[in-house]
């Protein structure tokens, strides 16, 4: 019996093939056990981690991972050369920059070496799985008596990223947030000089170079306000 099971996980064009064997008895072999799903994330297009839940196996199993790129010059099957481990059992594979081709369909295959027919294959669009590093070098400029401008840097192509800015004062219970496009600049037009403000930013690889759903980590926060603004009223970039 050869079945194809679709396992959508928020990444389009994702398929998993599970190979099952029919048994003469009522009991089914280990081949029927589904393999864990592989989740891949590309970190700032510097390396990629593809991981699985090794504890979902009924007994500790060193699953193996192979990969290739569909319909491309890179369609030769490659073995994982750098496994990640969890309690001495394989739980992932790390691919280096030169092995990452964002805009080709990435095919990843997980296999049980003790039961070679027990394997699962997924196809992933890596441009939708990029997670950039957190924004850095946040700076605040006072444009006028009541207007602040927040700037930051990213260690990636500016136009590939969108951003989310959050800010609040010490008097606020929740964050106010604002989406910012690739220009990575945010202005707060009305600032209360009596309050202390905290700002933070995160970034996402969307929509111009890919369609990633996951945000970066938050930047280190930056503060502005009553007890700090007297020191330098025009520029302040102290991190918490």
């Amino acid at each position: 019996l050869n079945t194809t099971i679709l396992t959508p996980n928020g990444n389009e064009d994702t398929t998993a093939d599970f190979f099952l064997t029919t048994m003469p008895t009522d009991s089914l072999s280990v081949s029927t056990l589904p393999l864990p799903e592989v989740q891949c994330f590309v970190f700032n297009v510097e390396y990629m981690n593809c991981t699985w839940n090794s504890s979902s196996e009924p007994q500790p199993t060193n699953l193996t991972l192979h990969y290739w790129y569909k319909n491309s010059d890179n369609d030769k099957v490659q073995k994982c050369s750098h496994y990640l481990f969890s309690e001495e059992i394989t739980s992932g594979c790390q691919l280096q920059k030169k092995e990452i081709h964002l805009y080709q369909t990435f095919v990843v295959q997980l296999q049980d070496p003790r039961e070679p027919r027990r394997q699962a294959t997924q196809m992933l669009k890596l441009q939708n799985l990029v997670i950039p590093w957190a924004p850095e070098n946040l700076t605040l400029h006072k444009l006028s008596e009541s207007q602040l401008e927040l700037n930051w840097n990213n260690r990636f192509l500016n136009h590939c990223l969108e951003h989310l800015v959050q800010y609040r004062t010490d008097w606020d219970h929740s964050w106010t947030e604002q989406s910012v496009d690739y220009r990575h600049k945010f202005s707060l037009p009305s600032v209360d000089g009596q309050k202390r403000y905290t700002f933070r930013v995160r970034s996402r690889f969307n929509p111009l170079c890919g369609s990633a759903q996951h945000w970066s980590e938050w930047s280190h926060p930056i503060h502005w306000g009553s007890n700090t603004s007297k020191e330098n009223p025009f520029l302040f970039a102290l991190e918490a």
Epitope: L102, Y103, L157, C209
Partner: nanobody, 125 residues
Framework: QVQLQESGGGSVQAGGSLRLSCTAS????????MGWYRQAPGNECELVST???????YYADSVKGRFTISRDNAKNTVYLQMNSLKPEDTAVYYC???????????????????WGQGTQVTVSS
């Protein structure tokens, strides 16, 4: 931060030559496919030429045989040598950087203002 900086534009007679340069920050240049776009007043942003990180190139039909793109990885710089210039080459030229493989496998229209300020090229007849 300014990630791409163009230079080398100017005014020239038809038939003349110019060489545009674009310098990128190291972390941008190393893993990017680089390209040149142009935009004339009232026109859309037009892809002129690209060079991938492995050195393969693309040219728009309108510039084939006249323009040459190259990259100097040691200097983080991409060049556009423009020969036999025509009045219709008059535009603001923008240097662009894309994730590796973008041009050959993904594509999609771009706005010229995604990148720097550009450099003006004016060709008079």
């Amino acid at each position: 931060q300014v990630q791409l900086q163009e230079s080398g534009g100017g005014s020239v007679q038809a038939g003349g030559s110019l060489r545009l340069s674009c310098t990128a920050s190291r972390f941008i240049f190393d893993d990017s496919d680089m390209g040149w776009y142009r935009q004339a007043p009232g026109n859309e942003c037009e892809l002129v030429s690209t060079i991938s990180s492995d050195g393969s190139t693309y040219y728009a039909d309108s510039v084939k045989g006249r323009f040459t793109i190259s990259r100097d990885n040691a200097k983080n710089t991409v060049y556009l040598q423009m020969n036999s210039l025509k009045p219709e080459d008059t535009a603001v030229y923008y240097c662009a950087a894309e994730p590796r493989g973008y041009y050959s496998n993904y594509g999609g229209r771009r706005e010229c203002n995604y990148w720097g300020q550009g450099t003006q090229v004016t060709v008079s007849s």
